[in-house]
Amino acid sequence: HKSSSQGQDRHMIRMRQLIDIVDQLKNYVNDLVPEFLPAPEDVETNCEWSAFSCFQKAQLKSANTGNNERIINVSIKKLKRKPPSTNAGRRQKHRLTCPSCDSYEKKPPKEFLERFKSLLQKMIHQHLSSRTHGSEDS
């Protein structure tokens, strides 16, 4: 039970870290290539992980201007790191009925990042709701 709880905590930490990285990138939105990217919104239940992978696959890029290029590139790279898997995530990977990435509305980097953050927050909330007891921080 303890290792399962630690796994849950690791997952929660990773999702929370992704939000912090998104917030960091939002500070540099003017230094990103103003390209339109698929940005899932109002994702249907059980398609969260599919939408998450669309955000991770999107070609967010630094405009290579100014002093911020390194921090932007590191942040983008960290956003693409695979989070610890959960049972819900494993189950959703087998769903074939979720929309393809290309079918989602394309948005510029600012809105793309805002929608990514909203999805991450939704996933954290779902994750917490599925836990019946125990502290996230113990």
Partner: antibody, heavy 117, light 106 residues
Framework: QVQLVQSGAEVKKPGASVKVSCKAS????????MHWVRQAPGQGLEWMGL????????IYNQKFKGRVTMTRDTSTSTVYMELSSLRSEDTAVYYC??????????WGQGTLVTVSS | DIQMTQSPSSLSASVGDRVTITCRAS??????LNWYQQKPGKAPKLLIY???RLHSGVPSRFSGSGSGTDFTLTISSLQPEDFATYYC????????FGGGTKVEIK
């Protein structure tokens, strides 16, 4: 058990720099990011930033950008916070706090930094 | 930046009293709110995370509620060890603390 042990009190002159350390034990160091928070005498808590202990990625409070540098040494499970161009308003207790899943779950004992000419 | 405003800044109460502290965010932070307790000369300790969830080892007399911009920390029956300063903290966008509420003995 999780422990965060910080370095001792420091007295610095205005314009100088200070480097505070925070040694972690009781868990896998690189599994958890670390926050730094400060508290001026009789005042509230102020978030300074955080560091990814696995690869020194940092996110700083805009207020301290350009003056604060957070680093780490994985061989000793220690994180560092350096603040430069010190002024009297930087007199405060500086805390490290572990980045738990949704909160700062463990805190160091604090390091008092006094800036005085 | 998200500002957090706590009220009152201090209050006097007796052992056994029900105490309520409020925290208001300058914008919607959903449930992304934590509460910490700090005693003089000590580091803060986590009490409640994600608005209403009790951190391990925290007595059940502590509870949290709210959503959006308005949040409450309640101590149902104040104990001698509860006299301290309490801080709310948002983690919707990076981190910001409230100014603190000092709970003193009446």
């Amino acid at each position: 058990q999780v422990q965060l042990v910080q370095s001792g009190a420091e007295v610095k002159k205005p314009g100088a720099s200070v480097k505070v350390s925070c040694k972690a034990s009781g868990y896998t160091f690189t599994d958890y990011w670390m926050h730094w928070v400060r508290q001026a005498p009789g005042q509230g808590l102020e978030w300074m930033g955080l560091i990814d202990t696995s690869d020194v990625y940092t996110i700083y409070n805009q207020k301290f950008k350009g003056r604060v540098t957070m680093t780490r040494d994985t061989s000793t499970s220690t994180v560092y916070m350096e603040l430069s161009s010190l002024r009297s308003e930087d007199t405060a207790v500086y805390y490290c706090a572990r980045y738990g899943p949704l909160a700062m779950d463990y805190w160091g004992q604090g390091t008092l930094v006094t800036v005085s000419s | 930046d998200i500002q957090m405003t706590q009220s009152p800044s201090s209050l006097s109460a007796s052992v056994g009293d029900r105490v309520t502290i409020t925290c208001r965010a300058s914008q919607d932070i959903s449930n992304y709110l934590n509460w910490y307790q700090q005693k003089p000369g000590k580091a803060p300790k986590l009490l409640i995370y994600y608005t209403s969830r009790l951190h391990s080892g925290v007595p059940s007399r502590f509870s949290g509620s709210g959503s959006g911009t308005d949040f409450t920390l309640t101590i149902s029956s104040l104990q001698p060890e509860d006299f301290a300063t309490y801080y709310c903290q948002q983690f919707h966008t990076l981190r910001t603390f409230g100014g603190g509420t000092k709970v003193e003995i009446k």
